[in-house]
Interface confidence: medium
């Protein structure tokens, strides 16, 4: 047992500290009291400390804390609400490409169907970006209607261009004709299969970063239990209570403490090691008909064989609706006729011949690697804040929130603690309210990117020719097909640098956090992430 | 949040044209993806569509109004207008701007707040 | 013209009790539906769109169900403020219609 430090028979360091905290000394004794109505910093003497200073001692700490707890996050944070922006910026940019690919090959292909051809595109796109960002639109709805809109423009122009124009009432039955007839074949059904598979897991992808960045916003805001705090308080300040400013709390003894304050925190990590697993599984399944970029930038030579295809079959398919919408006299038609002109963007057609080094592809494979180094923030963080707290280190000459020892105890130290405080207890409470609906959130998330994953045992072979399909080759399972024989118009052979386009490079590497207020810590969080490596045996 | 007011006259004389603008602001009548649309509503009656105009100038009207009806828009002021002519009687009406989603999502989902109109000499 | 045909049209009915309202269309308008609801002197407000989906911020007291020709609006548990005219409105084909409106009166 060390002996005890001499008292501060004036409490004057103790006042000279307290007030930086709380400008005034209006509560500060200026010399020893008995303290028997305190309730934290339990005295075992005289000592310096008021009721008043303590709860001021708790309501500081808990400010430590939540402090604490923003600057671990800060990183993690920072890359996640970066790489959402990035990508609904690159999604947005790959439907814009495909929009405009689509109206040149309209133009360059069959002028006598803009602006009409280019309204429905330009409608058609625009569900496109609205179901990514999660819009209640059916894909199927989206294509049909595309196809629905298209074919009475196809046959009065293409097919049947002498038709007069008191004849052009047709339009609702040829609408209808275009599904029972199947005038585009397949190749709706081979759209519908694409578009959506590779939408839904676009839209699941973004969706779940979203998700990421509204976890770490949970944890990050958390309000720390009146219980932590007086945790907290007898850890950081009760030493000061007798007079000892330099000592610093043990290092076992801060675990401990951090451990019964994040109890509930620390119950997110096994889903959020889940998140990240399952995100990866989803990442590396994003290809071929599971890779937007892939599928939307390949559309317009699907869209094209779809006319060809009509235009093999227009003698027959021209007498038999001839039959069937000869006596049509509905006057109506479905909302989406009229034409509505919009424009071709030519300086985008120009960018697919270029070659393109950086893909969305090999974006998204960079994220995943980044995100697996915080697999364990949640598990880490204890002892992260312990790391980037005043500790004593070897856990020698310390303080145990009691007194001050030579070598800190885990059993002694709770022994010490019963009368004061359940750390037991504080972990049986269970996460708060705000924590077990994130932790909910995070369940179906994980349960979506589960089942958005390919299928195992039907990975598909990278290495086939994506370009090389006949519209005849694909079979009954569409799920292998990719749209698409040449048709000598704009290859896209190379996908597109679409970062190059973003106004921001916003890469995680050359954040720097001086944007934000600097705390004393701020130059720590780089190695915040590393914890991973120690914690984690899933790295 | 989109906002749209109709101003005009509240008081047209039979067989004039009877004009309105809508206002816009929070969102641009020149971007694609929307349909600008007038509908009105007779006293103490239902709701009828007049017409609606798109970002690129063409319109679509009800084809019991279209010989009377004309919708323009006007960019550089973020407004559309209205004008029906040779009004009568029947024209008397609360009458509405209101946007919708081009296409598929084709419900009418910002409205002004209306405003009167009375023909009568 | 799509004709749309509400029933009843007016009702009355006290708070906490259950109300369907109906709307026939003249023909096959798949699911694209929408109801609305209008008080005195002011602009109609949507509450359901494409036949079931409630629009963001509207009460969960109201649903709609259908398609095809046949479509329901129920409010599951009147209160105060739900007396208005409520109207169907088609947007499959043009020119788009309203139903003629049923008036709500709450007892």
């Known amino acids: 047992q060390p002996p005890p430090p001499p008292p501060d028979a004036t409490c004057h360091q103790v006042r000279s500290f307290f007030q930086r905290l709380q400008p005034g000394l209006k509560w500060v004794p200026e010399t020893p009291v008995p303290g028997s109505d305190l309730q934290v910093c339990l005295p075992k003497g005289p000592t310096c400390c008021s009721r008043k200073m303590e709860e001021k001692y708790q309501l500081t700490a808990r400010l430590n804390m939540e402090q604490l707890l923003q600057s671990a996050s800060m990183e993690l944070k920072f890359l996640i609400i970066q790489n959402a922006a990035v990508f609904q910026e690159a999604f947005e940019i790959v439907v814009r490409h495909a929009k405009n690919y689509t109206n040149a090959m309209f133009k360059n292909n069959y002028p006598s169907l803009t602006p009409q051809a280019f309204e429905f595109v330009g409608e058609f796109f625009t569900d496109v970006s609205l179901y990514i960002l999660g819009s209640d639109i059916n894909v199927d709805d989206m294509v049909n209607e595309l196809f629905d809109s298209l074919f009475p423009v196809i046959y009065t122009q293409l097919m049947n261009p002498g038709l007069p124009d008191s004849a052009l009432d047709i339009n609702e039955c040829l609408r209808g004709a275009r599904r029972d007839l199947k005038v585009f074949g397949n190749f709706p059904k081979l759209i519908m299969t694409q578009v959506s598979k590779s939408l839904q897991v676009t839209r699941i992808f973004l969706q779940a970063l979203n998700l990421g960045i509204e976890v770490i916003n949970t944890t990050d805001h958390l309000k720390f239990s009146k219980d932590c705090g007086r945790m907290l308080t007898r850890m950081w300040y009760c030493s000061y209570c007798q007079g000892l400013m330099m000592v610093k709390p043990c290092g076992g003894y801060c675990n401990v403490v951090m451990q019964g304050c994040m109890a509930g925190v620390v119950e997110i990590d096994k889903y959020w090691r889940e998140y990240i697993l399952s995100l990866e599984e989803l990442v590396n399944g994003m290809y071929r008909i599971y890779d937007m970029e892939n599928v939307l930038l390949g559309l317009f030579s699907t869209i094209h064989d779809s006319i060809q295809y009509v235009q093999k079959n227009a003698g027959k398919l021209t007498t038999t609706i001839g039959k069937l919408c000869a006596h049509s006299q509905q006057r109506q038609y479905r909302s989406a006729y009229y034409p509505e002109d919009l424009f071709i963007d030519k300086k985008v057609l120009k960018v697919a011949h270029v070659e393109h080094e950086e893909t969305l592809s090999s974006r998204r494979r960079e994220l995943i690697q980044k995100l697996k180094s915080f697999i364990s923030f949640y598990s880490a963080l204890p002892g992260y804040i312990c790391s980037h707290s005043p500790v004593a280190e070897n856990d020698t000459l310390c303080w145990n929130g009691q007194e001050l020892v030579e070598r800190y105890s885990q059993k002694a130290a709770r022994n010490g603690m019963k009368n004061q405080f359940n750390l037991h207890e504080l972990k049986m409470k269970g996460p708060e309210p705000v924590v077990s609906q994130i932790i909910d959130k995070l369940k179906h998330i994980n349960q979506l990117l589960r089942t958005m994953s390919m299928p195992k045992g039907r990975v598909l072979d990278k290495n086939l020719d994506e370009e090389g399909f006949e519209s005849g080759d694909c079979g009954d399972d569409e799920d292998e097909c990719i749209g698409g024989s040449g048709d000598g118009m704009i290859k896209v052979k190379n996908q597109l640098r679409f970062l190059a386009e973003l106004a921001y490079d916003l890469d995680v590497d050359d954040a720097p956090g001086n944007s934000q207020q600097a705390t004393p810590k701020d130059n720590e969080i780089s190695t915040f992430h590393n914890l991973g490596n120690v914690h984690s045996p899933l790295k | 949040e989109v906002q749209l007011v109709e101003s005009g006259p509240g008081l047209v004389k039979p067989s004039q044209t009877l004009s309105l603008t809508c206002t816009v602001s929070?969102?641009?009548?020149?971007?694609?993806?929307?349909?600008w649309n007038w509908i009105r509503q007779h006293p103490g009656k239902g709701l009828e569509w007049i017409g609606y105009?798109?970002?690129?100038?063409?319109?679509d009207y009800n084809p019991s109004l279209r010989s009377r009806l004309t919708i323009s828009q006007d960019t550089s002021k973020n407004q559309f207008s209205l004008k029906l002519s040779s009004v009568t009687a029947a024209d008397t009406a609360v009458y509405y701007c209101?946007?919708?989603?081009?296409?598929?999502?084709?419900?009418?989902?910002?409205w002004g707040q209306g405003t009167m109109v009375t023909v009568s000499s | 013209d799509v004709v749309l045909t509400q029933s009843p049209s007016s009702l009355s009915a006290f708070v906490g009790d259950r109300v369907t309202i109906t709307c026939q269309a003249s023909q096959d308008i798949r699911k694209y539906l929408n109801w609305f609801q209008q008080k005195p002197g002011k602009a109609p407000k949507l509450l359901i769109y494409?036949?079931?989906t409630l629009e963001t911020g509207v009460s969960s007291r109201f649903s709609g169900s259908g398609s095809g020709t046949h479509f329901n609006l129920v409010i599951s548990s009147l209160e105060p403020e739900d007396s208005a005219t409520y109207y169907c409105?088609?947007?499959?084909?043009?020119?788009?219609?309203f139903g003629q409106g049923t008036k709500l009166e709450i007892k």
């Open positions: 105009i798109f970002n690129s100038g063409n319109t």
């Open positions: 494409d036949a079931s």
């Open positions: 409105q088609q947007h499959d084909f043009v020119p788009r219609t």
């Open positions: 929070g969102g641009s009548v020149s971007s694609g993806g929307y349909h």
């Open positions: 209101a946007r919708h989603r081009s296409r598929l999502l084709r419900w009418f989902d910002y």
